[in-house]
Interface confidence: medium
Amino acid sequence: MDGSGEQPRGGGPTSSEQIMKTGALLLQGFIQDRAGRMGGEAPELALDPVPQDASTKKLSECLKRIGDELDSNMELQRMIAAVDTDSPREVFFRVAADMFSDGNFNWGRVVALFYFASKLVLKALCTKVPELIRTIMGWTLDFLRERLLGWIQDQGGWDGLLSYFGTPTWQTVTIFVAGVLTASLTIWKKMG
């Protein structure tokens, strides 16, 4: 990732501000959607609803679809279930760092990061640690800003996600996403 130097200004799709705003909206919506599928109300996730434009709605639908597919990957679910959340910050940043450790960036890995964050949030809900929820969202946005922002800008903003997953082979790509996350969790388990 080309990391240094000033970022584009203004409100275009590749500005730092717009990428972070859209990223926060997508992450919040994705986590709320995953929690909703668990059944039951989660007042801790009653974050301020933010109006989404047509483009963001499309992106949200795309993420939901990938999330559903990942939910059905039993190997991935088994790995996530085995994650020890006693030190969630260390787990999150190690797994996130390992996902991108080879220096190669793609939308699949960005989605894998969001999915892992959502799973940690759901674990926090299940273990009655609601204060962790906003914190995990914060960690994800920190990582996004520090590691992925430049790359997302290079892709023309978040809309690049739609073209990446908008192909007939998006299920194949989703299998790849699951593989990336499973591999990172495996590395973390070995190191932990």
Partner: antibody, heavy 117, light 109 residues
Framework: EVQLVESGGGLVQPGGSLRLSCAAS????????IHWVRQAPGKGLEWVAS????????YYADSVKGRFTISADTSKNTAYLQMNSLRAEDTAVYYC??????????WGQGTLVTVSS | DIQMTQSPSSLSASVGDRVTITCRAS??????VAWYQQKPGKAPKLLIY???SLYSGVPSRFSGSRSGTDFTLTISSLQPEDFATYYC???????????FGQGTKVEIK
């Protein structure tokens, strides 16, 4: 042009408090991450604390945890380091820096904090 | 915490010499390593980020490389203005956000 300007340093007695400011210009602090790094006389660089205003996340070195507090006022585009229970070993030049990706790309000129009786 | 062991702590060299400074991470830090130059009484300046990327405005005689957990800063032909102290720094993940090496002072022979 990106600029970071620190202020608030000075002489303080052990156990005393001091608040350092880091005024940023040329970029939006809200979407950035700001870090305080210190350098004791004749010594190397030591990371002290970080803040990510967008998410509200803050991180501290073990040596200052519980004594120092990093914060940001995005309306003033300024970050702060509140230093309490100061010790002689906190004597150093304190720099604020902005990071992007894997590096701190812009640094302030530094402000000297001397803890002595 | 991740430790960054920098060597040598100081070295003497002449103008035109090729200078190499190394940093070893105590565990994998991917390519999340930067190098800085600091002159007396001044703030550090970024030279290299992401292990091998040259920061804008930095002369091309500076280069960085990575081999596993070993990171190297090379100055291909030392210039008078290069006499300074150099630091490596890692930022792999934020359990301890940034760790600096001990520094290498490059002096005139």
């Amino acid at each position: 042009e990106v600029q970071l300007v620190e202020s608030g340093g000075g002489l303080v007695q052990p156990g005393g408090s001091l608040r350092l400011s880091c005024a940023a210009s040329g970029f939006n602090l809200y979407y950035s991450s700001i870090h305080w790094v210190r350098q004791a006389p004749g010594k190397g660089l030591e990371w002290v604390a970080s803040i990510y205003p967008y998410s509200g996340s803050t991180y501290y070195a073990d040596s200052v945890k519980g004594r120092f507090t990093i914060s940001a006022d995005t309306s003033k585009n300024t970050a702060y380091l509140q230093m309490n229970s100061l010790r002689a070993e906190d004597t150093a030049v304190y720099y604020c820096a902005r990071s992007y990706g894997y590096a701190m790309d812009y640094w302030g000129q530094g402000t000297l904090v001397t803890v002595s009786s | 915490d991740i430790q960054m062991t920098q060597s040598p702590s100081s070295l003497s060299a002449s103008v035109g010499d090729r200078v190499t400074i190394t940093c070893r991470a105590s565990q994998s830090v991917s390519s999340a390593v930067a190098w800085y130059q600091q002159k007396p009484g001044k703030a550090p300046k970024l030279l290299i980020y992401s292990a091998s990327s040259l920061y804008s405005g930095v002369p091309s005689r500076f280069s960085g490389s990575r081999s596993g957990t070993d990171f190297t800063l090379t100055i291909s032909s030392l210039q008078p203005e290069d006499f300074a102290t150099y630091y490596c720094q890692q930022s792999y993940y934020w359990v301890s956000p940034f760790t600096f090496g001990q520094g290498t002072k490059v002096e005139i022979k």
